[in-house]
């Protein structure tokens, strides 16, 4: 069956970028890096200059959701993290500008951002039981939990 958000008419309006140029490290202290033009992966780095820097933009839901809804963009590019299905790699989608409004099938661009102490979780709005995750010898993907790693540390001001 279709994900619940595709069945609803919830509209998400862009508010503002709330973080620029941060790095995501998973629970094994691996940083997210570019695997190729389309995919991301995770690796233990000595030099964080190789890590992907992300910008995070906040969106407001028309249904006044208490969750923080965000879009993730690779800094200084027009590439946005896009969810696919469970165990499928997230894609990098090129768009000329950040979307003013997101609804329907485009919610695969959005994630619910939750924090628990220093742990950060990104749940797909299109697939609300799945998280952005790292997996050994695989691309960054959507996963429901172990053995994939779904919690991340945000490292800011690395410039």
């Amino acid at each position: 069956s279709a994900p619940f958000s595709f069945l609803s008419n919830v509209k998400y309006n862009f508010m503002r970028i709330i973080k620029y140029e941060f790095i995501l490290n998973d629970a094994l202290n691996q940083s997210i890096i570019r695997a190729n033009d389309q995919y991301l992966t995770a690796a233990a780095l000595h030099n964080l200059d190789e890590a992907v820097k992300f910008d995070m933009g906040a969106y407001k839901s028309s249904k006044d959701d208490a969750k923080i809804t965000v879009i993730l963009r690779i800094s200084k590019t027009q590439l946005y993290v896009t969810a696919q299905d469970e165990d499928q790699p997230v894609l990098l989608k090129e768009m000329p500008e950040i979307p003013k409004t997101i609804t329907g099938s485009e919610t695969n661009l959005l994630f619910f951002w939750e924090t628990h102490g220093t742990k950060n979780y990104f749940t797909s709005v299109a697939h609300p039981n799945l998280f952005i995750a790292t997996k050994q010898d695989y691309w960054v993907c959507l996963a429901g939990g172990p053995p994939s790693i779904t919690d991340f540390q945000i490292l800011e001001n690395q410039a």
Partner: nanobody, 122 residues
């Protein structure tokens, strides 16, 4: 009513310096992230630099990093941009503004005032 009045622009030779000022009124200046944006002749708006309300953190576009310095004096409700080692490609109208919602999406820019023209030419 929000008012931002930029000044300090002018004609300068390549390698020269200028200091821009922006006098703010009509809002609580010391609560806002402030920014400088610019528009080169025939081009779109470009974010240049931002500064947090206290002035503790500053941010710069790659094109001006190491040459420009943003600062503020909250007691005077004034924003500054010190521009050194100026280049021909810095020629633009410079506006001060509240930090745009997205530094890299021009539709989110919201600026006021007439701006101040900086021309870098020999």
């Amino acid at each position: 009513e929000v008012q931002l009045l930029e000044s300090g622009g002018g004609l300068v030779q390549p390698g020269g310096s200028l200091r821009l000022s922006c006098a703010a009124s009509g809002f609580t200046f010391d609560r806002y992230i402030m920014a400088w944006v610019r528009q080169a002749p025939g081009k779109g708006l470009e974010w240049v630099s931002s500064i947090t309300p206290s002035g503790a953190a500053t941010y710069y576009a790659d094109s001006v990093k190491g040459r420009f310095t943003i600062s503020r004096d909250n007691s005077k409700n004034t924003l500054y941009l010190q521009m050194n080692s100026l280049r021909a490609e810095d020629t633009a109208v410079y506006y001060c503004a509240e930090e745009p919602a997205d530094r890299y999406s021009t539709w989110t820019f919201d600026y006021w005032g007439q701006g101040t023209l900086v021309t870098v030419s020999s």
